[in-house]
């Protein structure tokens, strides 16, 4: 049985340029202990989008709108979206390790597409 599930409920999100994009992620447990990070893309070349513990991410805010008894919300919102932000975003749980944290489980990803700004 899975110790923890990472749930990205939306396969895709479409946002007009200049607007904010909300990327949803829920987890069924805090255990195993370790941080949660957001990335764009997968593999070695992925780009870190948000890490609450360290770094400066001025366009990203955390959004925890709906508190459910059986899961934990780790959603984010990215402001002032541009076409360069298009891609697939992954919510990733890490397990605390020594000396480095170890990737434990990733969500299925949410593809962000950017529509032209309405004229």
């Amino acid at each position: 049985e899975d110790e923890l599930q990472v749930i990205q409920p939306e396969k895709s999100v479409s946002v007009a340029a200049g607007e904010s994009a909300t990327l949803r992620c829920a987890m069924t447990s805090l255990i195993p202990v370790g941080p949660i990070m957001w990335f764009r893309g997968a593999g070695a070349g992925r780009e870190l989008i948000y890490n609450q513990k360290e770094g400066h991410f001025p366009r990203v805010t955390t959004v925890s709108e709906l508190t459910k008894r059986n899961n934990l919300d780790f959603s984010i919102s990215i402001s002032n979206i541009t076409p360069a932000d298009a891609g697939t975003y992954y919510c990733v749980k890490f397990r605390k390790g020594s000396p480095d944290d170890v990737e434990f489980k990733s969500g299925a990803g949410t593809e962000l597409s950017v529509r032209a700004k309405p004229s």
């Epitope: 049985e1 110790e3 447990s29 195993p32 959004v63 508190t67 008894r69 934990l72 780790f74």
Partner: antibody, heavy 118, light 111 residues
């Protein structure tokens, strides 16, 4: 109805060992993170140990690390706390508690008393 | 370790009045907009019982005269109006970071 029933407490000499058990019923035990929390009149509530739902991951505070071992048997809906090298400061009421999300303690047992004294 | 400081240690409130308990964490217990702060009630001879989870969410079956508020380091449990069966000791607890820690408790009595 959720029930957590602790057993195994008692009087033990310093340096001795005890094994506490917690029998769970009324919920899907294998889906829950489980913990032990102890309470003393002097120190209040203190978290003692936590185990993940599948039993892979365990966590302890420094005060018991290396002396206490937490395990579970999901087939038997049971939780076990092996306590070795007991000290006088381990004297407390020990509660078994469930955590659906590994966050707040949802349900608590009635507790079992451990007394470490010569 | 995150130190949880509860105040006051004891509180006497008239029936029907408001009881307010504070809990201050030595560092933020917030993560991704979640506040990992919880409140429990303990009556003599009984185990603690969950009242409020993640700062402000009422546990199922708990009367709505109990409410929780706060974020980051400062949190409040309010009982309004206080009833005779609310006489108990109340504890805050953080699960933001290991080791998980509890406040020292607030004993609520009837004035």
């Amino acid at each position: 109805e959720v029930q957590l029933v602790e057993s195994g407490g008692g009087l033990v000499k310093p340096g001795g060992s005890l094994r506490l058990s917690c029998a769970a019923s009324g919920f899907t035990f294998s889906s829950y993170v489980m913990s032990w929390v102890r309470q003393t009149p002097g120190k209040g509530l203190e978290w003692v140990a936590t185990i993940s739902s599948g039993g892979t991951y365990t966590y302890y505070p420094e005060s018991v690390k290396g002396r206490f071992t937490l395990s579970r048997d999901n087939a038997k809906n049971s939780l076990y706390l092996q306590m070795n090298s007991l000290r006088a400061e381990d004297t407390a009421v020990y509660y078994c508690a469930s955590q659906l999300t590994g966050s707040e303690f949802d349900y608590w047992g009635q507790g079992t008393t451990v007394t470490v004294s010569s | 370790d995150i130190v949880m400081t509860q105040s006051p240690a004891s509180l006497a409130v008239s029936l029907g009045e408001r009881a307010t308990i504070s809990c201050r964490a030595s560092e933020s217990v917030d993560s991704y907009g979640n506040s990992f702060m919880h409140w429990y009630q303990q009556k003599p001879g009984q185990p603690p019982k969950l009242l409020i989870y993640r700062a402000s969410n009422l546990e199922s079956g708990v009367p709505d005269r109990f409410s929780g508020s706060g974020s980051r380091t400062d949190f409040t449990l309010t009982i309004n109006p206080l009833q005779a069966e609310d006489v108990a000791t109340y504890y805050c607890h953080q699960s933001a970071d290991l080791p998980w820690t509890f406040g020292g408790g607030t004993k609520v009595e009837i004035k």
